[in-house]
């Protein structure tokens, strides 16, 4: 008799999930000598232990604590780049500006980036058919709780000037419901963080508006100021030129506004 299986609204676990996590861990620890003490088998076991045999709508931050402990990593606290709805450009930037870090440049972020996973209550199986959707099913699902946990810890570690890249092409440039808006903003530590500097990335080539005056940016400024953190904002009118100038800052065209 086939066992009844819960049908969730979201896509199932990414195929070859265990192998992918193990492979990413090995690759990361190869590339980052400071993380070579990490035992990737233990990392996988802790990752698996966070969600296997548990109801995928009843996952807690506590479930991920063994994994958090194993993945503890020190990044320069004044070199943190947050992002919202503009991940690819943020990652392109840190690939060039190697002394700055997004969450996905850390071991735990790198392991889970773009992956989906969930298990089933009381079975050791991974569910490759479907996983809970944050809106349609439940917010305390394995993927959402993971990102909430690592994002909180990442924001808590930040100091001095923290940068955030925001997508100026979206209707809500700052979205209170994004991970940045709901988790990271509220976990920056005012006693450590002096300034949050927003980089608003323009989409259209002819777009010369000052998007730092956008109502949602003003809302972000208000939230940050109330937390006793200074706020600044820059328009990045030409993201392609911006990246080019990060690569080649001596270029004569890089003295003008980008």
């Amino acid at each position: 008799v086939p066992r009844w299986r819960q049908q969730w609204s979201g896509p199932g676990t990414t195929k070859r999930f265990p192998e992918t996590v193990l492979a990413r861990c090995v690759k990361y620890t190869e590339i980052h000598p400071e993380m070579r003490h990490v035992d990737c088998q233990s990392v996988w076991d802790a990752f698996k232990g966070a969600f296997i045999s548990k109801h995928p709508c009843n996952i807690t931050e506590e479930d991920y604590q063994p994994l958090m402990k194993l993945g503890t990593q020190t990044v320069p606290c004044n070199k943190i780049l947050l992002w919202s709805r503009i991940k690819d450009l943020a990652h392109q930037f840190t690939q060039v500006q190697r002394d700055m870090f997004t969450l996905e440049d850390t071991l735990l972020g790198y392991l889970a980036d773009d992956l989906t996973w969930c298990g089933e209550f009381n079975t050791s199986k991974i569910n490759y058919q479907s996983c809970p959707d944050w809106r349609k099913d439940c917010s305390n699902n394995p993927v959402s709780v993971f990102w909430k946990t690592v994002s909180r810890r990442f924001a808590e570690a930040a100091c001095d000037v923290v940068h955030v890249m925001l997508n100026g092409s979206r209707s809500k440039i700052f979205d209170k419901n994004s991970t940045f808006g709901s988790v990271e903003v509220h976990n920056l530590q005012p006693e450590k963080v002096q300034t949050l500097e927003a980089w608003v990335i323009h989409g259209g080539r002819e777009d010369s508006r000052d998007l730092c005056q956008d109502p949602t940016i003003k809302e972000l400024e208000s939230i940050i100021s109330k937390r006793n953190i200074q706020f600044s904002c820059k328009n990045i009118y030409r993201p392609d030129k911006f990246l080019q100038c990060v690569k080649n800052p001596e270029d004569s065209s890089c003295t003008s506004e980008i």
Epitope: P18, E19, L22, A23, C25, V26, T29, E30, R36, H37, D39, C40, Q41, S42, W44, D45, K48, S124
Partner: nanobody, 122 residues
Framework: EVQLLESGGGLVQPGGSLRLSCAAS????????MSWVRQAPGMGPEWVSG????????YYADSVKGRFTISRDNSKNTVYLEMNSLRAEDTAVYYC???????????????RGQGTLVTVSS
């Protein structure tokens, strides 16, 4: 270039012991899980044992549990298989393999050596 060189095989009587070694080069040894796989004449390969990168996690096939011990020395880039209470059915070519690790069902292997022959016979 990844190289895995097994040694220590030979002829041994039932109930006897052997210690296999595998010297690895061409990769960052300490981040890779290592395993031993064997292939008896006319049979398919059988995973025997595995050890995680740091050596903290070890795994064994039921057929060798309690008789074989896997270990590694990351300072020497070497993995070992201590084999005790050997039986005729342990006769096989023993291969050393590097890989990603064990997910509870599958051992993910990347490279395999040339093997060393173990013969258990009186």
């Amino acid at each position: 270039e990844v190289q895995l060189l097994e040694s220590g095989g030979g002829l041994v009587q039932p109930g006897g012991s052997l210690r296999l070694s595998c010297a690895a080069s061409g990769f960052i040894f300490s981040v890779y899980a290592m395993s031993w796989v064997r292939q008896a004449p006319g049979m398919g390969p059988e995973w025997v044992s595995g050890v995680s990168g740091s050596g903290i996690n070890t795994y064994y096939a039921d057929s060798v549990k309690g008789r074989f011990t896997i270990s590694r020395d990351n300072s020497k880039n070497t993995v070992y298989l201590e084999m005790n209470s050997l039986r005729a059915e342990d006769t096989a070519v023993y291969y050393c393999a590097s890989g990603k690790g064990w997910d509870g069902n599958t051992w993910y292997e990347d490279y395999r050596g040339q093997g060393t022959l173990v013969t258990v016979s009186s």
